[in-house]
Interface confidence: low
C-alpha cells in the first residue's frame, strides 16, 4: 500500500507545529503539536518524550508511566490526582507534564 | 560523576574520510539526545547534528552530505565523509538535556574535551 | 533557518560592573535559549536554560531573561573569573526538518 505525500502510516506520528499559548501568568509557553494516525484501541500519547500511538487504556485509567513517556534512564513519576507525570534525569533535572 | 570524552582526531588529508567517537562515563549513551559541535581554530561553536535514542538524526543545513551521525551502544560516533581544509577544528560532543522536540527546552549540559581535526595536505 | 545576532562581539569591564549581552533570534524561539561560558582550550559550559533558568553550581551572579526573539544575559558584579567568551544557543523544531539549533557568534569578556 502507496502512502500519499502528508499521508501517515499507520500507528505513527509526526511532530507538526510549535504553537504559541499563554499560561495564567501570561508568560508565554511553548506546545508542541503531533499529528498521529493511530490504530483500533490507541491514542496519541507519548513515549520515550516523543509523540506516539499508545493503548487507550493508559489513557483511560491515566496511568501515564505505562506508556514509557521518559528517555531511557530517567524515572516516571505520577502527578497527585494522576494529572499527568514528571520524568526525572539521572542529575535531578525534572521534567514535569500535566495533561489538561 | 557523568562525563565525556571524544576519541579520533587526527591530521588528515583532504577527501580522506574520518570517524569521531564519543564514549560516556557515568551514565548510558543510548537513553539520551547527544549533539555534535565543532569550532575551528580562534572561531566561534558551529552545532553539527543531533541524534535521537532510534538512532535517528538531524542536521544543520550546511553539514547535511558533509557528516554522518550514528551510534552503537557504547559510542555516539561523527563521520566526517569528505574532509576539506575548512574542516579543521575541534569538535566537541555533547549531551542534549531536556526533550528534544520542544525547541525551548533543548540545551547541552555536558560537553566533553574536545578532539582536534586537522585537514591539510 | 534560525540566526542568532549576538551582541556586542566583545566587551571590556571591571571588576563590580553588570555586564549585558544580548542576542536576537530571526524568529519566535519560544524561550528556546541556553547560555554557556567557555574560558581558552576548553569546552562550554552551560550557565543558563530555558531563557531564565539558573544551572546547577552556576553563581547567581549569572542571570538570563527575555522571551519572544531577543534574549539577555546579565552577569551582575563581574568578577574577574568571569573573563571568558560567551555563546548563545537557540533550538525550534519544525515538522518539516526536525530540530534545528543555531550559536550566536559568541561575546569575549575582557575584565579590566
Known amino acids: 500500500q502507496f502512502l500519499k505525500e502528508g499521508q501517515l502510516a499507520a500507528g505513527t506520528c509526526e511532530i507538526v507545529t510549535l504553537d504559541r499559548c499563554c499560561n495564567k501568568n501570561r508568560r508565554t509557553i511553548a506546545r508542541q503539536t503531533a499529528r498521529c494516525a493511530c490504530r483500533k484501541g490507541q491514542i496519541a500519547g507519548t513515549t520515550r518524550a516523543r509523540p506516539a500511538c499508545v493503548d487507550a487504556r493508559i489513557i483511560k485509567t491515566k496511568q501515564w508511566c505505562d506508556m514509557l513517556p521518559c528517555l531511557e534512564g530517567e524515572g516516571c513519576d505520577l502527578l497527585i490526582n494522576r494529572s499527568g507525570w514528571t520524568c526525572t534525569q539521572p542529575g535531578g533535572r525534572i521534567k514535569t507534564t500535566t495533561v489538561s | 560523576q557523568e562525563q565525556l570524552v571524544e576519541s579520533g582526531g587526527r591530521l588528515v588529508t583532504p577527501g580522506t574520510p574520518l570517524t569521531l567517537s564519543c564514549t560516556a562515563s557515568?551514565?548510558?549513551?543510548?537513553?539520551?539526545?547527544m549533539s555534535w559541535v565543532r569550532q575551528a581554530p580562534g572561531k566561534g561553536l558551529e552545532w553539527i547534528g543531533i541524534?535521537?535514542?532510534?538512532?535517528s538524526t538531524d542536521y544543520a543545513s550546511w553539514a547535511k552530505g558533509r557528516f554522518t551521525i550514528s551510534k552503537t551502544s557504547t559510542t555516539v560516533d561523527l563521520k566526517i565523509t569528505t574532509p576539506t581544509t575548512e574542516d579543521t577544528a575541534t569538535y566537541f560532543c555533547a549531551r542534549v538535556a531536556g526533550y528534544v522536540g520542544y525547541g525551548y527546552e533543548t540545551f547541552f549540559d555536558i560537553w566533553g574535551p574536545g578532539t582536534l581535526v586537522t585537514v591539510s595536505l | 533557518e534560525l540566526v542568532m545576532t549576538q551582541t556586542p562581539p566583545s566587551l571590556s569591564a571591571s571588576v563590580g560592573e553588570t555586564v549585558r549581552i544580548r542576542c536576537l533570534a530571526s524568529?519566535?524561539?519560544?524561550?528556546?535559549i541556553s547560555w554557556y561560558q567557555q574560558k581558552p582550550g576548553k569546552p562550554p559550559t552551560l550557565l543558563i536554560y530555558?531563557?531564565?533558568n539558573l544551572e546547577s553550581g552556576v553563581p547567581p551572579r549569572f542571570s538570563g531573561s527575555g522571551s519572544g526573539s531577543d534574549y539577555t544575559l546579565t552577569i551582575g558584579g563581574v568578577q574577574a573569573e568571569d573573563a571568558a567568551t560567551y555563546y548563545c544557543l537557540g533550538g525550534v523544531t519544525y515538522s518539516s526538518t526536525g530540530t534545528h539549533l543555531t550559536f550566536g557568534a559568541g561575546t569575549n569578556v575582557e575584565i579590566k
Open positions: 530555558g531563557a531564565s
Open positions: 524568529e519566535d524561539i519560544y524561550s528556546g
Open positions: 541524534i535521537y535514542p532510534s538512532g
Open positions: 557515568g551514565f548510558f549513551l543510548s537513553g539520551y539526545y
